[in-house]
Amino acid sequence: EPERCNFTLAESKASSHSVSIQWRILGSPCNFSLIYSSDTLGAALCPTFRIDNTTYGCNLQDLQAGTIYNFRIISLDEERTVVLQTDPLPPARFGVSKEKTTSTSLHVWWTPSSGKVTSYEVQLFDENNQKIQGVQIQESTSWNEYTFFNLTAGSKYNIAITAVSGGKRSFSVYTNGSTVPSPVKDIGISTKANSLLISWSHGSGNVERYRLMLMDKGILVHGGVVDKHATSYAFHGLTPGYLYNLTVMTEAAGLQNYRWKLVRTAPM
């Protein structure tokens, strides 16, 4: 008849797809079983190996991420229970929808993590790594996206996503995106026969530079670039009484926005 075991837990650790457990038998040799189970798996025997005279272990691979596994070391009907949770995994893909980006909003999307996830934490940081906004979104098979509003136009942002399962968090994955810069406001034109003086007022948010283009039937005739502080620009050497298409482009954070206007030089 086997003796009842007296055991103590020596070590337990978990990663996203594996767990390792070690325990020590105190006193004389005895018989035991190590059983593991999860809410979806059912019970199974954990293959045990001997480390030394008193220490035993079990390593399990290919487990589901973010899942709670119950381990029971049982000798006759005496048992010690150890609860281990595998680490959740972040989404495999995470990005910004450029087509849904506006001057004041960024739309992010992700593919669901493999394994078990209870929620996702999505955080928005500015260029200086200061947290601007954060949100916790309950896991859903149908809703793997989020839009950040009330942002500054023409700004670069870093976005982090972290999967949460129970009390554990995955490592974070990052993506970046930029809001579209605001276009200029109140374009003013002062016309002469051979020149045009263009003036404007700044829109909201950040600007890196202004690009001005004077087009004739879709062909660039004159162009110039000015810094973000400028509010005017002059085109010279133009044809008197001629109709041009004027575009004032705002550039920031790798994106552009513009306003355009039809302008005519003064006749001779």
């Epitope: 008849e1 086997p2 009842r4 005895c30 018989n31 035991f32 079983s33 190590l34 059983i35 189970s37 979806t40 798996l41 059912g42 019970a43 199974a44 025997l45 293959p47 045990t48 049982i74 000798s75 006759l76 009907d77 005496e78 048992e79």
Partner: antibody, heavy 122, light 107 residues
């Protein structure tokens, strides 16, 4: 050698009560979980319930068909297992087996008694 | 409760031939499945535990396999003494439950 001997079976009227006993020997009774399993004449096996050890607070578990009517208990000082059956129905007619199970050496082993017949009939 | 569905209900196999009995669990039970052999007027005898481990003294013509929800007991070469009813049982979660049994006879 593990021995499990059931007793207390017999004829009882519907609505009546009966108490079955199981005398255990050949193993450390107080360290083992114990079960009752029954088998109606010509039918299959049905697990009735299980009682765990003192260190597990003598926790009991039952099949839905007997819950609130049957009670499993044990007396470790007498190496005995009991099944108190109340509000008996004709469908409780069966041979009742006392079963020891234990986990040891990566095993799950069961030992069975010879059974005692309970007949519920008017 | 976890329902264990055995198939077939009965099986007639020639001596020396293979007999295969299936057991399907209504939900995952891992490998916490035992197989029993019961002969007339006798209590069941444990053959296999943890789905595939033979109990001490059980001939090696008996083997078990499966995990999750689908389990199989195979008698590789049927002998006259193997005529019996065979039951599967899950002990993954309470209440423990048995399959309905499969009667194995000689053809």
């Amino acid at each position: 050698e593990v021995q499990l001997v059931e007793s207390g079976g017999g004829l009882v009227q519907p609505g009546g009560s009966l108490r079955l006993s199981c005398a255990a020997s050949g193993f450390t009774f107080n360290a083992n979980a114990m079960n009752w399993v029954r088998q109606a004449p010509g039918k299959g096996l049905e697990w009735v319930g299980r009682i765990r050890t003192k260190s597990n607070n003598y926790a009991t578990y039952y099949a839905g068909s007997v819950k609130d009517r049957f009670t499993i208990s044990r007396d470790d000082s007498k190496n005995s297992l009991y099944l108190q059956m109340n509000s008996l129905k004709t469908e409780d007619t069966a041979v009742y087996y006392c079963v020891r199970d234990y986990y040891g050496s990566s095993a799950w082993i069961t030992y069975w008694g010879q059974g005692t017949l309970v007949t519920v009939s008017s | 409760d976890i329902v264990m569905t055995q198939s077939p209900d009965s099986l007639a196999v020639s001596l020396g031939e293979r007999a295969t009995i299936n057991c399907k669990a209504s939900q995952h039970v891992g490998t916490a499945v035992a197989w029993y052999q019961q002969k007339p007027e006798q209590p069941p005898k444990l053959l296999i535990y943890w789905a595939s481990t033979r109990h001490t003294g059980v001939p090696d013509r008996f083997s078990g396999s499966g995990s999750g929800t689908d389990f199989t007991l195979t008698i590789s070469s049927l002998q006259a003494e193997d005529v019996a009813v065979y039951y599967c049982q899950q002990y993954s979660s309470y209440p423990f439950t048995f399959g309905g049994g499969t009667k194995v006879e000689i053809k």
